[in-house]
Interface confidence: medium
């Protein structure tokens, strides 16, 4: 239904707190360099304006679109060109081109310092002084570093953050209460960020149809008792919500997500028996809970998939009558039977089925042609299953850090031209798949591993797009989203690469490494490992292990030495010589 004033409508629907949070996220995601104070001022102005429109929908400018109102605010910021360069050119355009222009200037890898957590006492003091400002800072800092973060979900994480601080700041030992809890929230939020970025990439590169197919597969796995029409209704609504968030329409997105959660809770009988616990929660927790609700129990009497999609004499007729609906029912039927498959795999199977029908339905004897299609799925299913087994075995043998190093070597060999920081970030993220997925029950491993890897590789592609340097990476990133992971897995050593010159300074370390937190130490060591592989792409695993063990021993010795500086300056060059010899 149309509203006289869009901004008043959203303010009324969302309430002041969520409205302000979402506007702050929107501004922070568009203009990533502005300070919190600059954005907070704009948010207050927009909120005050929204209140005037609530009081009188006919007041001046209240009938303007949200894009127009927000865009005008952003374009009125002083020194826009000095701070943002060509992004300022967006302000010469009219809506909707202006918003499109802002979207194109979102930076997936902004040059901002890492978000450092203050120590517990200081954090609790500022939280107690002004909880609203404290949470505003959190939203701003996360949103500007993750310009596609799913906004209503970020409000949920801020709420979690708030609850943790409220609880832990009342404890005697604030530090030991806060650290594990906030680390948990941070880890979940980072995974949420890469997953959402993948959804926006799917929408941006391949359109709504591709995202809707993803949603149909995912929802069919989770709600196998819902009928096809119910699944596609949910998929249609979910597509709209994600399209809005990916497009920067955060108020609409959050409002529609709340509506979808309401619909699901009012229609549990036709969706799933597992929703009640989620539906008892308040809004943000409810929507979050529904997004990761456990799979419903599969119906016991499902007929074999072959009955309708291979053996039925009218397969080609049904396909010709309404291709999208027929393929949609195939994806639905296959997915509801396979909660143990990844969404990426299900979409590959649907694509294979479609290609088979396209080919076979044009032949003289279609049934003879498509009769073997399910058998042809076998290699497509075996490939990711083998990937999971191999990688989880390796993770169990090496642990997370060792597993990350194995992946780092593998990926540096596949794409040695990629910058070392990007390779290290990717390997560390890819390596976390072990901790995240390999400890799960067998039937949950494949969906966890492959869908997580796909999201991480999407980030690799986004970073590579900015400065393309590897033909291998370009090739894998140019194809469809669901083929990316198999493409990367299939890459071998890049034979075209000319090894890097050996530079002693790359492997020269100083005593300041000793005081770094464990994570930073690991990154330093992994940076050195990637550089070694770039110097000797064909070094054996044994050679690299020798060098890395020697390196670890060197750090351990010098960090324990009485005179650390002297140790580093005398032993360092010896280490470099030994490394060169070991790799010769």
């Amino acid at each position: 239904e149309a509203h006289k004033s869009e901004i008043a409508h959203r303010y009324n629907d969302l309430g002041e707190q969520h409205f302000k949070g979402l506007v702050l996220i929107a501004f922070s995601q568009y203009l990533q360099k502005c300070s919190y104070d600059e954005h907070a001022k704009l948010v207050q102005e927009v909120t005050d304006f929204a209140k005037t429109c609530v009081a009188d929908e006919s007041a001046a400018n209240c009938d303007k679109s949200l894009h127009t109102l927000f865009g005008d605010k952003l374009c009125a910021i002083p020194n826009l060109r000095e701070n943002y360069g060509e992004l300022a050119d967006c302000c010469t355009k009219q809506e909707p081109e202006r918003n499109e222009c802002f979207l194109q200037h979102k930076d997936d890898n902004p040059s901002l310092p890492p978000f450092e957590r203050p120590e517990a006492e200081a954090m609790c003091t500022s939280f107690k002084e002004n909880p609203t400002t404290f949470m505003g800072h959190y939203l701003h800092e996360v949103a500007r570093r993750h310009p596609y973060f799913y906004a209503p979900e970020l409000l949920y994480y801020a709420e979690q953050y708030n609850e943790i601080l409220t609880q832990c700041c009342a404890e005697a030992d604030k530090e030991s209460c806060l650290t594990p809890k906030l680390d948990g929230v941070k880890e979940k939020a980072l995974v949420s960020s890469v997953r959402q970025r993948m959804k926006c990439s799917s929408m941006q590169k391949f359109g709504e149809r591709a995202f809707k197919a993803w949603a149909v597969a995912r929802l069919s796995q989770t709600f196998p008792n819902a009928d096809f029409a119910e699944i596609t209704k949910l998929a249609t609504d979910l597509t709209k919500v994600n399209k809005e968030c990916c497009h920067g329409d955060l108020l609409e997105c959050a409002d529609d997500r709340a509506e979808l959660a309401k619909y699901m809770c009012e229609n549990q009988a036709t969706i799933s028996s597992k929703l009640q616990t989620c539906c008892d929660k308040p809004l943000l927790k409810k929507a979050h809970c529904l997004s990761e609700v456990e799979h419903d129990t599969m119906p016991a009497d499902l007929p074999a998939i072959a009955a309708d999609f291979v053996e039925d004499q009218e397969v080609c007729k049904n396909y010709a009558e309404a291709k999208d609906v027929f393929l949609g029912t195939f994806l639905y039927e296959y997915s509801r039977r396979h909660p143990d498959y990844s969404v990426s795999l299900l979409l590959r199977l649907a694509k294979k089925y479609e290609a088979t029908l396209e080919k076979c339905c044009a032949e003289a004897n279609p049934p003879a042609c498509y009769g073997t299609v399910l058998a042809e799925f076998q290699p497509l299913v075996e490939e990711p299953k083998n990937l999971v087994k191999t990688n989880c075995d390796l993770y169990e043998k090496l642990g997370e850090y060792g597993f990350q190093n194995a992946i780092l070597v593998r990926y540096t060999q596949k794409a040695p031209q990629v910058s070392t920081p990007t390779l290290v970030e990717a390997a560390r993220n890819l390596g976390r798949v072990g901790t995240k997925c390999c400890t799960l029950p067998e039937d949950q491993r494949l969906p966890c591993v492959e869908d997580y890897l796909s999201a991480i590789l999407n980030r690799v592609c986004l970073l590579h797009e900015k400065t393309p340097v590897s033909e291998h990476v370009t090739k894998c990133c140019s194809g469809s989203l669901v083929e990316r992971r198999p493409c990367f897995s299939a890459l071998t050593v890049d034979e075209t690469y000319v090894p890097k010159e050996f530079k002693a300074e790359t492997f020269t370390f100083h005593s300041d490494i000793c005081t770094l937190p464990e994570k930073e130490k690991q990154i330093k060591k992994q940076t050195a490992l990637a550089e070694l592989v770039k110097h000797k792409p064909k070094a054996t695993a044994e050679q690299l292990k020798t060098v890395m063990d020697d390196f670890a021993q060197f750090l351990d010795t010098c960090c324990k030495a009485a005179d650390k500086d002297t140790c580093f300056s005398t032993e360092g060059p010896n280490l470099v010589t030994r490394c060169k010899d070991a790799l010769a």
């Epitope: 008792n225 819902a226 009928d227 096809f228 029409a229 119910e230 596609t232 209704k233 249609t236 619909y263 229609n267 009988a269 036709t270 119906p299 499902l302 007929p303 309708d308 049904n318 609906v325 027929f326 029912t329 039927e333």
Partner: nanobody, 119 residues
Framework: EVQLLESGGGLVQPGGSLRLSCAAS????????MLWVRQAPGKGLEWVSV????????YYADSVKGRFTISRDNSKNTLYLQMNSLRAEDTAVYYC????????????WGQGTLVTVSS
């Protein structure tokens, strides 16, 4: 007992319009997706259109897309099919059916209403 009663069929000239209705009883209509199917003389059953319990989304066979509109009134337990720009090949017995939990098939259907498109 599930009952579905179609009405509104008849003889119409090519290019003309008809509106079919289907009165439902014996099940919870407002939680059931519904569809229209048709059977042309000497042919097999062909599904025409599906509608979700809430009224959206809707789906159409390619052959009727842009000409037919499915709708429902849950307060009256009634399903509708508005048919415009009718063609000779739309001649068939039209059945309304309750959409099942599985496959593009159907669980229950009525006795049908005949639509004849002829000049």
């Amino acid at each position: 007992e599930v009952q579905l009663l179609e009405s509104g069929g008849g003889l119409v000239q090519p290019g003309g319009s008809l509106r079919l209705s289907c009165a439902a009883s014996g099940f919870t209509f407002d939680t059931s997706s519904m569809l229209w199917v048709r059977q042309a003389p000497g042919k097999g059953l062909e599904w025409v259109s599906v509608i979700h319990q809430s009224g959206t989304p809707t789906y159409y066979a390619d052959s009727v897309k842009g000409r037919f509109t499915i709708s429902r009134d849950n307060s009256k337990n009634t399903l509708y099919l508005q048919m415009n720009s009718l063609r000779a090949e739309d001649t068939a017995v039209y059945y309304c059916a309750k959409f099942p939990s599985s496959r593009m098939k159907f669980d229950y259907w009525g006795q049908g209403t005949l639509v004849t498109v002829s000049s």
